[in-house]
């Protein structure tokens, strides 16, 4: 399978909410012993391999933001920890996987990575990620709502297997 990033750039005004999205593409193993570990984290642009460095999002680590569920299931982070930080990650039946960030500040600007790991009995079989940039703006040049910029077809299926 692959991870697509429908939008490579999100430009939002301060105080707005934004939902960053990744999508699982291609054949997905639906065996009874297969689950999917999905999470989000921040990274930096200047790396040899995008998304290899893992930084917290609003002090929450990739472990705190993870979902771990079966292939047929929808899921979302229900624990108070994420919601207290204005964050919620979610996954639906159609392969869409997102993180919602509420009340954006300039400090939220940066590179965000989604990670999907196919797990078979607690062991990783396949690992892919996608990257996108969030720019939070303030002042007269800031848009009134979030503006999203589609990925190029090459970027939208950007995949790195570990």
């Amino acid at each position: 399978f692959k991870v697509a990033t429908p939008y490579s750039l999100y430009v939002c005004p301060e105080g707005q909410n934004v939902t960053l999205t990744c999508r699982l593409l291609g054949p997905v193993d639906k065996g009874h012993d297969v689950t999917f570990y999905k999470t989000w984290y921040r990274s930096s642009r200047g790396e040899v391999q995008t998304c290899s460095e893992r930084r917290p999002i609003r002090n929450l680590t990739f472990q705190d933001l993870h979902l771990h569920h079966g292939g047929h299931q929808a899921a979302n982070t229900s624990h108070d920890l994420a919601q207290r930080h204005g964050l919620e990650s979610a996954s639906d039946h159609h392969g869409n996987f997102s993180i919602t960030m509420r009340n954006l500040t300039l400090l939220d600007s940066g590179l965000y990575c989604c990670l999907v790991v196919e797990i078979r009995h607690h062991h990783s079989e396949h690992r892919v990620h996608g990257a996108m940039e969030l720019q939070v703006q303030t002042g007269k040049d800031a848009p009134s709502n979030c503006v999203v910029y589609p990925s190029s077809s090459q970027d939208s299926e950007n995949i790195t297997a570990a």
């Epitope: 993870h66 790991v117 797990i119 607690h122 062991h123």
Partner: antibody, heavy 122, light 112 residues
């Protein structure tokens, strides 16, 4: 400090049922897979059940499949083992153990509780 | 099921000596993802097992560097370079590569 405290062990007759609990503290319980491991009177260790962090996946060896059910309540930070149709060979000390992982990829059973004793005898 | 066989059953040592425990699996425990999920645990008298080594040779946090793990495929070894009194107990190897996960029968490290 990671703490796992098992309870619910007892003397039970063959064919009976028992529910074990494992109260977890000192870590974010919902981030980790968990297992139950038992130690028989001859000191052999046997893994009896495992569950992933979200509770969507469980596994049992043939020796307990269909008789034991592992579950978890992430809000209560508690792991459970429901045991039914108990046999004398289920007599053991039962330990809960945390699965040390990264991205859901298993590394080891890094922390164990002190155990709760189950005796199946008529 | 993968059978894990430990030798010796009992290992009498003098304090300060080197100790070596062998663990052999009935089939390769290299997982399809390339990792070998072989661990070593120590159970001291009256206590629960404690993790020493994971993925063949990685020491768990707080484990002294006198403990080392090695091996590949089906043959694995735990070495204790200089045995101390606190090292006494039963050592178990464990494979987490293939379900069901299985333990070795244990090796009792005791004073000679």
């Amino acid at each position: 400090e990671v703490q796992l405290v098992e309870s619910g062990g007892d003397l039970v007759k063959p064919g009976g049922s028992l529910k074990l609990s494992c109260a977890a503290s000192g870590f974010t319980f919902s981030n980790y897979g968990m297992s139950w491991v038992r130690q028989t009177p001859d000191k052999r260790l046997e893994y009896v059940a495992t569950i992933n962090s979200g509770g969507s996946y469980t596994y049992y060896p043939d020796s307990v499949k269909g008789r034991f059910t592992i579950s978890r309540d992430n809000a209560k930070t508690t792991l459970y083992l429901q045991m039914s149709s108990l046999k004398s060979e289920d007599t053991a000390m039962y330990y809960c153990a945390r699965i040390y992982d990264y991205d859901g990829d298993y590394y080891a059973l890094d922390y164990w509780g002190q155990g709760t004793s189950v005796t199946v005898s008529s | 099921d993968v059978l894990m066989t430990q030798t010796p059953l009992s290992l009498p040592v003098s304090l300060g000596d080197q100790a070596s425990i062998s663990c052999r699996s009935s089939q390769s425990i290299v997982h399809t993802n390339g990792n070998t999920y072989l661990e070593w645990y120590l159970q001291k008298p009256g206590q629960s097992p404690k993790l020493l080594i994971y993925k063949v040779s990685n020491r768990f946090s707080g484990v002294p560097d006198r403990f080392s793990g090695s091996g590949s495929g089906t043959d694995f070894t735990l070495k204790i370079s200089r045995v101390e009194a606190e090292d006494l107990g039963v050592y178990y190897c464990f494979q987490g590569s293939h379900v069901p996960w299985t333990f070795g029968g244990g090796t009792k490290l005791e004073i000679k």
